[in-house]
């Protein structure tokens, strides 16, 4: 999901963008700040035990348009939001997990055996 209404074709920014990073900090980050020519992101997904985990960081311009589009991934429940409008803009992104589909409950509400289905997040 794009938070700033950009066109889908990735265009080079004239300047570097700084983003908050958490659980996703590259080696060249400092004090949980990374830098990129692309987007800042925040993502929520379930780990193997079904616990929601939030990660945030930088996406390089190359391939980021696809990653930010938040396309469904079979058997994975997750949502990602991307932004570029200011430095550390991803501090203000709060994606939520898409709701469980009814068929996710056929074996009862135990997360680790489910085939989770990803929904677009808007």
């Amino acid at each position: 999901k794009k938070e700033d209404g950009e066109s889908t074709a990735p265009t080079a920014r004239p300047k570097v963008l700084r983003c908050k990073c958490h659980h996703h900090c590259p080696e060249d980050s400092v004090n949980n700040i990374c830098s990129t020519d692309g987007y800042c992101f925040t993502m929520i997904e379930e780990d193997d035990s079904g616990t929601p985990v939030v990660t945030s960081g930088c996406l390089g311009l190359e391939g980021s348009d696809f990653q930010c589009r938040d396309t469904p991934i079979p058997h994975q429940r997750r949502s990602i939001e991307c932004c570029t409008e200011r430095n550390e803009c991803n501090k203000d992104l709060h994606p939520t997990l898409p709701p469980l589909k009814d068929r996710d409950f056929v074996d009862g509400p135990i997360h680790h055996k489910h085939h989770h289905h990803h929904h677009h997040h808007h």
């Epitope: 300047k15 060249d28 400092v30 020519d37 190359e62």
Partner: antibody
Framework: QVQLQQPGAELVKPGASVKLSCKAS????????MQWVKQRPGQGLEWIGE????????LYNQKFKGKATLTVDTSSSTAYMQLSSLTSEDSAVYYC?????????WGLGTTLTVSS | DVVMTQTPLSLPVSLGDQASIFCRSS???????????LHWYLQKPGQSPKLLIY???NRFSGVPDRFSGSGSGTDFTLKISRVEAEDLGVYFC?????????FGSGTKLEIK
């Protein structure tokens, strides 16, 4: 053409503060970061920090935290660096420089002399 | 901080000669985006530095093609194919991959 105008020289007393200016022209001020670099004779170039005029976001070299404060005035496309508690160690040439992913244009520099 | 080690400190050349300046970083300058932010500047006496080469090998606008940059990871080279009088001055390498950004100590290109 891109220009970064800086005063040629400043003379200040030890213990005082000084605010150096850098007026940008020839490009959209908010589209690039502004960096500040210190050069002392025989000491090479030292990166002080940078500011993004579009949101006033700053990054500092740890060495200059508490010494330098970066600000901008977007209405006049001017960047400022305030240096506090000046000592002779602060005597140097200070450059402002336009930064996207690398510095492509430098100001002419301000020679700061700290002397009583 | 990333230490940029430049060699030689001084490079005496004759006009028309080829000159090579080397820069080594204490850690890799390959950024997480895949770009390598290593740049070269020339500073003439009494002037501010001027950009020659950005991102290892890209000549900045107006820079003559006798200047070329190469290298990867931690080792980089600036070559001047035929030195002209206007090329004399101090050459600096600089990295903008890691904060704080750092510079080499400079190489003085002078007439032999």
């Amino acid at each position: 053409q891109v220009q970064l105008q800086q005063p040629g020289a400043e003379l200040v007393k030890p213990g005082a503060s000084v605010k150096l200016s850098c007026k940008a022209s020839g490009y959209t001020f908010t589209s690039y970061w502004m960096q500040w670099v210190k050069q002392r004779p025989g000491q090479g170039l030292e990166w002080i920090g940078e500011i993004d005029p579009s949101d006033n976001y700053t990054l500092y070299n740890q060495k200059f935290k508490g010494k330098a404060t970066l600000t901008v005035d977007t209405s006049s496309s001017t960047a400022y660096m305030q240096l506090s508690s000046l000592t002779s160690e602060d005597s140097a040439v200070y450059y402002c420089a336009r930064f996207g992913y690398y510095v492509d244009y430098w100001g002419l520099g301000t020679t700061l002399t700290v002397s009583s | 901080d990333v230490v940029m080690t430049q060699t030689p400190l001084s490079l005496p050349v004759s006009l028309g000669d080829q000159a090579s300046i080397f820069c080594r970083s204490s850690q890799s300058l390959v950024h997480s985006t895949g770009n390598t932010y290593l740049h070269w500047y020339l500073q003439k006496p009494g002037q501010s530095p001027k950009l020659l080469i950005y991102k290892v090998s890209n000549r900045f606008s107006g820079v003559p093609d006798r200047f070329s940059g190469s290298g990867s990871g931690t080792d980089f080279t600036l070559k001047i194919s035929r030195v002209e009088a206007e090329d004399l001055g101090v050459y600096f390498c600089s990295q903008s991959t890691h904060v704080p950004f750092t510079f080499g100590s400079g190489t003085k290109l002078e007439i032999k």
